[in-house]
Each structure stands twice: as C-alpha cells, then as structure tokens.
C-alpha cells in the first residue's frame, strides 16, 4: 500500500542554525522514508534532505543546515514520502524566511528608574547576536509587580542596530518592584523568541498616595467624653514598597477651627475623646518626599439621627471566598464601609475593615478568615461625608463539629417527667452555628428514645418516663458539620409524686 | 504585464567585446534571480549566466567563465551581460529570462550575437 | 555535473499520444526538479511542465510530466496531439556541481 501523502507541512528558520520542516504523519505502518526536496536562492538551487527509516525511525522532520541556508529568501518545500510500494508526494508549500524567521531572545541586563523622571522604568537590553543585523525587531515586554501573578504586555518595534538598546516604561506605579522580560522577532516573522531571563526593577519613591480612614465609635463615658478609634491604612491602590515616616492628626468641632488639635503618631491607629459635637477630623501621612493627599472624616454629633437604608443582607460561600450581597434603598449610595472582626466572648484582637464603591457587594478570600471562627460583618452605608446605619451578619468560612457538647442538667424531677436544662456552648467552642439540640435519653435496659429542638431553645420538660427508673440523658448541638455530645447525666424518676405524697399525709 | 527586452546584439569580431542590455517591466525587478540563456543556431538551450537578486552572487557556466559578466541595475531595473574575448562559438541567439520560483517563467524575444571576422 | 540526454525527434500522429523521455547521465533523478519547455521556430520558449509533474495554468491539461527513478529520467507526455504541438521542447534541471541549470538537447516533434 502507498505511503499517506505528506500533509500539514510547517517550517521554521532558526537564524544562522537550521531550516526545519515536520510533517504529517508522523509514523507509516510500513518501512518508509522521506525526502524533502528545497528550492532556495529564490528558487535558482535545489537540493534535498533525507530522513532514513532505519536510523531516523520514520521521523517526521527534516534540517537543512549552513552554508546553503540564504537570507532573505523564498524557498518551495516539497516531502515525498516512500515505501516499497511506490512514491507519495506532498503539494509543494512555499516558505518565505522572514516570515519563518525565530531569533534568540534578548539579554535584558538592566532595570532602573530614571532620577527625577516619576513612575518610569528604563529597560536596557542587548540585542541577539544571531539576529539579521539589519532587520527591524519587534518586541514583547511583559512585566508585573513583583507580589501579582498577572502580566501585562507592551509591544513595540526598534529599527536601530545599536547592540545596546533601551525602551522607557512609563505610567507604573511609584515606588514598586517590576519583574520584567522581553522576547523579540524579525518584524515580519510569525515567530517569537522565547522569553528572556527575568530582571528586577524599582520606580521612584514620591510622596505617600493617600490614606483610607475609619473609625470605631464608642459609648460616652461618664463625664460625657466620647472615645473615638480612629484607623487609617495605605489607600487601595498605593505602592506596595510605600513606607510613611509618619502621620499627622488634626480635627476640631464643627464651625470652630479656634479648637483645632494636633497629634503627631507613627502608629496606624489612634483614640480621641471628643465631645459630644459634631468633629471634622483629617489625617495625613508623610515621608521624606512630602505629604499625602488630606484623609477626612465627619464625626456625627452624639445626638445626631442617622439614615438608615440597607433592607437586606447576605453571606454566601463559593468555592474559595466568602462573598456578602446587601440591598439598598438609597440608589445615590455608592460608597460603603465593611467591617468585619471574630466574635469572640472577650475584647476582638483583630479588627479589620474596607471600603468599597460602586457595587453592593463584598468579597474575602476564605484564607484570610480562620476556619470554625465566627465572624461579625457590619456595612456602613457612606453618603458624602455621612455615616449610615450598619447592616450586620455573622458568617463562618468553614463549620465543623462544636469542641464540646452542652452542659445539661435534670430539674424538676417527677414520676413520669423531667425537665432538662442546658447551657449555651461558649462562642470559641462552637465552630459553627448551632441548627439544633438533641435530647438522647434512655431507661436502664431500655430503648433510646430522642428529641430535637430548634437552637433557641435550652430547656426541655420530657414527658411518659416510666416512674422509679434510671435513665441516662445527653444533649448533642449540632452544626452543618455534625454534632457533639454533652456530658452524660444519670436520674432517677420518683415512686410517687411529691404533689401526691403531701396530700395524702394531710388526710 | 511582464515584459523583457533584449538589445545591444549584432556582428562583431573574435577577441572583441560586446555589452547586451534587457529593459524589465511590468514586476519588482529586484525580488527575482536573473539569467542569461543562449541558442546556437539550429542548436539546443544553452545556459550561460545568473544572478541574484541584489547582484552581489553570480554563477556563470565554465566556457564563459572570466570573458563574461553578469551584472544588474535595480534602479532602471536592467540587466547586463558583458561579454569580452568573443569566439565564434559564441553566436547565437541571447534570451534574457527570469528565474521564477520553480523554472524560467518568462522569456525575452532574444538578440542576435554574431561573432565573425 | 550531469547531462540530460533526449532524443533528437520524435513523430506522432494527429490525436495520438507521445512521451519525450529525457535521462540524466548520474546522480538521481529526482534530486532536483525537471522543467520542460516548448519553442516554436522563431521564438523564444515557454515552460509547459514545471516541478517533475506541475502544470502551468495556462498551458492544456493535455501536457504531463512524470520521473521515473528506475530508468533515472523525466518523461513528457502529450496526449490528443493537435498541430499547434509541432515544436522543440527542452528538459532542464538544476546541477549543484556546476551551481547552475542544466538543458537537454532537445526533441523535434513532428505531428503527422
């Protein structure tokens, strides 16, 4: 049988190594070789290439290799495939070297921000010894902040045969590491280098980008003083590398500047007493190069009503974040406060809190929530300078089991009834929200019988016990996850009831 | 249209020199090989010299080699054959052809070269 | 260097079909492609065959073109022969030796 004609025919010219060519297919059942036949020196020479069965193994490919190996050029490339039943021959292709062309890639070997030239990064490179040395190159710079997996791409073209070549990548952020590389091609090749190795690079320093600033309102103390926490951090969007020196504070009563207060701190955080006024409050952090743009904040009055317009909110889960959703009455809100901290039975260690715009919803990786914790979550709708009402949830990024089973107790103790009382499982060891509670009991001997009630409820009267019996009693909580026994208790109902016994006695 | 035409042919005498031009139109003259083929009278086809596209290679066959030069002007898209040291051998008909990808693809009308005392 | 050796004339009849063979003396026929070419008296020649077995658009699908490896020689075949056929045709190949095209010597065809 005849050998498959030779088809997808696809060639690559490796500068000053080798023109290759492959094909299809790649294996014949049957002893078979090939023979590429080339024209080339725009079709003046012709030569031939062999692939041998017996020492090639059928491989589907072919090299020409230098000196005859001419650029620019035009070749034809024709495979004839045969066996010992006949010749197969492809149709010819035709193979243009500068559109086949793949160069090495460049060498970058420097990365440094240009002084007193902001956000711009001056890549240096030279250019491939085995390039055409005439030709234009285009080339692919790719590059990331050092923290994100995410590349972005720039493409331009360099005519010039300098060796030493550079390109000014501007429009980056300040003060931050890039990781750069650059591949590069003949201008009119379909194929690229590959990528070059990597180089670090830092923009400039400039004064800090601006803050984001919250604050916790407390309850007034008993001399009227209102303790305020104020927080602030780096905004969204602000260098990575970004490092204050240092923040400075200033805030008074609404309409009365005279009152102006200063503080000075290094730290992120900071409590104010205020009266129970209106307060305008303004941060700033600074480093060597200057300040940030000013950071307000309106504390309301003590007495001051707040709008109200969040109707709803929920927490669900995907896969690998916790998403909240809440809906809004006030279209005109765009801009809102999260909040979110363990609840916890003591003081939260960890208070965090973010703004977001433009959207009614809040998204958090599960990994930077601990698993089994529950978690208060509290959105602020912000208006302007004005603080809404919060709209609080709890959510749990994973349940599990709860670390202990209730603490349970028989009162009340009668002939035929008992009636069972439990402790709420402290919040640290619950793991979970608590779906219900099942009572487990059963006589010396007997059948188990159970009982399950909703979580709001922590005392049970169980009724038709068999009177002057042991029995044995546990109460499980349960979460999504499972549940957990209590502690095991043991009673005994009574012969005759107290109720019967007096009355008797008084007859 | 692709056209290729030959002048500069004639009589002259052995161990004269004689220079034939070909005026190319109608494609990119400098994107092909060029080549200068001859026939004796009543003979066969009788390659005698090529060259490529920039000119800087040239290929001339051995009996013609050192009296013959190939040349080329991209600019009036020309071609040159200079011919020195002519034998009588040498008569015959000159065409002027270009190389396409795969066979000479297109020819001249031909000059006639005579070489007699 | 190689040549190509045809023979000097070949005849055939009106309609009948004739096969031009052309042998290259050494190396393979099929290391490098065979051209074939066609001229009229008085005029310069046109390729009819071109890449052992391709055809030129223009030229009738009456022309074909094959190599055979076992007698190491391109054959020209003309089929339905019409008159306008009487004429020279030429082998040619490229010889990487010389760095250069080589012809044959040529085959009259007669139409009879």
């Known amino acids: 049988v005849l050998p498959a004609k030779p088809e997808n025919i696809s060639c690559i010219f490796y500068y000053e190594e080798n023109f290759t060519c492959t094909w299809s297919p790649e294996k014949e059942a049957s002893y078979t070789w090939y023979k590429v036949k080339r024209t080339y020196s725009y079709g003046y020479k012709s030569d031939i290439c062999s692939t041998d069965n017996s020492t090639r193994g059928n491989h589907a490919s072919c090299s020409f290799l230098p000196p005859t190996i001419t650029n620019p050029d035009n070749y034809t490339i024709q495979v004839e495939a045969q066996n010992a039943d006949g010749i197969m021959k492809s149709d010819i292709t035709y193979w243009n070297l500068d559109a086949i062309m793949k160069i090495e890639p460049p060498e970058i070997f420097s990365v440094k921000s240009v002084l007193g030239i902001k956000r711009m990064l001056q890549i240096k490179w030279i250019r491939p010894v085995l390039a055409p040395h005439s030709s234009t190159l285009k080339y692919t710079l790719r590059f990331r902040t050092i923290n994100s997996a995410y590349w972005m791409e720039v493409n331009f073209t360099k005519e010039d045969i300098d060796r030493d070549e550079t390109y000014n990548l501007t429009e980056l952020q300040a003060f931050t590491e890039y990781v750069m590389t650059l591949r590069c091609a003949p201008a009119e090749s379909m194929f690229w280098s590959g990528w070059s190795q990597e180089k670090v690079g830092t923009t400039e320093e400039e004064a800090p980008y601006g803050l984001d600033l919250w604050r916790v309102l407390k309850p007034a103390m008993v001399d009227g003083r209102r303790p305020v926490q104020l927080m602030w951090k780096k905004a969204t969007g602000a260098p990575v590398l970004e490092k204050a020196l240092g923040y400075n504070i200033w805030y008074f009563p609404e309409n009365n500047t005279n009152l102006t207060e200063t503080v000075n701190t290094t730290n992120q955080t900071h409590e104010l007493y205020l009266g129970g006024k209106t307060y305008w409050v303004y941060v700033v952090s600074y480093n060597s190069l200057g300040e940030s743009p000013v950071a307000t904040l309106r504390i309301p009055a003590l007495n001051e009503k707040t709008f109200q317009c969040i109707e709803a909110m929920q927490a669900c889960l995907t896969q690998d974040q916790l998403v909240v959703e809440w809906q809004s009455s006030a279209p005109e809100v765009d801009t809102w406060m999260v909040e979110w901290f363990p609840d916890v039975d003591s003081e939260p260690s960890s208070f965090s809190w973010e703004s977001v715009s433009q959207a009614r919803n809040w998204t958090i990786q599960k990994d930077e929530l601990k698993p089994l914790w529950c978690y208060n979550i509290s959105v602020y709708p912000v208006l302007r300078d004005r603080v809404g009402q919060p709209y609080s949830t709890q959510a749990y990024v994973q349940e599990g089991i709860p670390s202990a089973g209730p603490v349970t107790q028989a009162d009340s103790i009668g002939v035929k009834t008992v009636t069972i009382t439990w402790k709420e499982i402290p919040k640290s060891k619950r793991n979970g929200f608590i779906k219900n509670y099942t009572i487990f009991y059963q006589a010396e001997d007997g059948k188990e019988f159970s009982k399950t009630v909703n979580s709001n409820i922590l005392q049970y009267r169980l009724e038709s016990l068999t009177r002057r019996t042991s029995y044995s009693l546990q109460v499980m909580a349960s979460t999504n996850a499972g549940g957990t026994n209590g502690t095991k208790i043991n009673f005994k109902t009574l012969s005759i009831s107290h109720h019967h016994h007096h009355h008797h006695h008084h007859h | 249209e692709v056209q290729l035409v030959e002048s500069g042919g004639g009589l002259v005498q052995p161990g004269r020199s004689m220079k034939l031009s070909c005026a190319a139109s109608?494609?990119?003259?400098?994107?092909?090989?060029m080549a200068w083929v001859r026939q004796a009278p009543t003979k066969g086809l009788e390659w005698v010299a090529s060259i490529s596209t920039g000119g800087g290679n040239t290929y001339y066959r051995d009996s013609v080699k050192g009296r013959f030069t190939i040349s080329r002007d991209n600019a009036k898209s020309t071609l040159y054959l200079q011919m020195d040291s002519l034998r009588s051998e040498d008569t015959a008909t000159y065409y002027c052809a270009r190389h396409g990808t795969l066979y000479f693809d297109y020819w001249g009308q031909g000059v006639m070269v005579t070489v007699s005392s | 260097q190689f040549t190509l050796t045809q023979p000097k004339s070949v005849s055939g009849s009106l309609r009948s079909t004739i096969t031009i063979p052309c042998e290259r003396s050494s190396g393979d026929i099929g290391d490098s492609y065979v051209s074939w070419y066609q001229q009229h008296l008085g005029r310069p020649p046109i390729n009819v065959i071109y890449a052992d077995d391709q055809r030129p658009s223009e030229v009738s699908d009456r022309f074909s073109g094959s190599i055979d490896s076992s007698s190491n020689s391109a054959s020209l075949t003309i089929t339905n022969l019409q008159m306008d056929d009487e004429a020279d045709y030429f082998c040619?190949?490229?010889?990487?030796?010389?760095?250069?095209?080589?012809f044959g010597g040529g085959t009259k065809l007669t139409v009879l």
């Open positions: 040619q190949s490229y010889d990487s030796n010389i760095d250069g095209p080589v």
């Open positions: 109608g494609f990119t003259f400098s994107n092909y090989y």
